[in-house]
Interface confidence: low
């Protein structure tokens, strides 16, 4: 029976993910009952990704490790639309690490997932990045410019944003 075997497959996939995420929120994509996309509860979803705002204050390295334990990375922002979605879930008086760093301090910015760094799709605050000793990027709110990126020292604890691909079951 087709529906029965599909359900069994789904359940075994769910069990597989349960070790990382005890609870998943799934929605049916399109009209086909076969296509379910899931994000861990209480992550938020946008397009093909899931996002988690981590409110614990940690260094950039520890923040990335924290995301990876959950099967994610620090967030890689690819479009203005994606950033506009993310900022809806942020607090204006906080700063959040992005998955963007300049390990050598030579302004060779790189994303954690190896996505090519594209100058044309960056949202630095004006005058940023400005310090070669500040090798990690955050997103924060400035009253004059709304939300944008700033370079800071990687060891200074901040909140962070994790991103992972949606889970399809």
């Amino acid at each position: 029976n087709f529906m029965y075997s599909k359900t069994v497959k789904r359940l075994s996939k769910l069990r597989e993910y349960q070790q990382y995420h005890p609870s998943l929120t799934c929605v049916m994509e399109g009209k086909d009952i076969e296509d379910w996309s899931c994000c861990p509860t209480p992550w938020t979803s946008f397009q093909s990704s899931c996002y988690f705002i981590s409110t614990g204050m940690q260094s950039w390295t520890k923040s990335q490790k924290n995301c990876s334990v959950m099967g994610a990375d620090l967030v890689v922002i690819n479009t203005r639309e994606e950033q506009d979605f993310i900022i809806q879930n942020l607090k204006r008086n906080s700063s959040y690490f992005l998955g963007l760093s300049d390990p050598g301090g030579r302004r060779h910015w790189q994303w954690v997932d190896q996505t090519p760094y594209n100058e044309n799709v960056t949202f630095w605050h004006s005058g940023e990045p400005n310090n070669l000793d500040e090798r990690c990027a955050i997103i924060n709110f400035r009253s004059s410019e709304e939300w944008g990126w700033n370079d800071i020292h990687c060891h200074v604890p901040q909140k962070s944003i994790c991103k992972m691909k949606k889970i399809y079951i």
């Epitope: 301090g105 310090n131 000793d133």
Partner: nanobody, 123 residues
């Protein structure tokens, strides 16, 4: 604040070389990241190069990369700018600047400035 005095400027033909020096006094030199900036007539002062406190991290403006070399001698409280393959567009007054702790390209982050030394490159 640290006091800074530049020297080594002059007139040179295109393709030639000059070495600028900057002597620092008054404060612990190793507390300061150092930078070179320049200002051509009628233009704004612009970033040229900067170097970290230890000297391990130089950084350059794209326009001088591969031609200019910044270095420092912490034992002598000196910072240098070796300028090779000079071009007429390098003509400017060159300023040495000091900034507590942070290696940066931004003028407004530097709290101590020298008086400047004139570099003229003729074609």
């Amino acid at each position: 604040q640290v006091q800074l005095q530049e020297s080594g400027g002059g007139l040179v033909q295109a393709g030639g070389s000059l070495r600028l020096s900057c002597a620092a006094s008054g404060r612990t030199f190793t507390n300061y990241a150092m930078g070179w900036f320049r200002q051509a007539p009628g233009k704004e002062r612009e970033f040229v190069a900067t170097i970290s406190r230890s000297g391990s991290m130089p950084y350059y403006a794209d326009s001088v990369k591969g031609r200019f070399t910044i270095s420092r001698d912490n034992a002598k409280n000196m910072v240098y700018l070796q300028m090779n393959s000079l071009k007429p567009e390098d003509t400017a007054v060159y300023y040495c600047a000091a900034n507590v702790l942070v290696t940066t390209t931004r003028l407004d982050q530097y709290d101590s400035w020298g008086q400047g030394t004139q570099v003229t490159v003729s074609s």
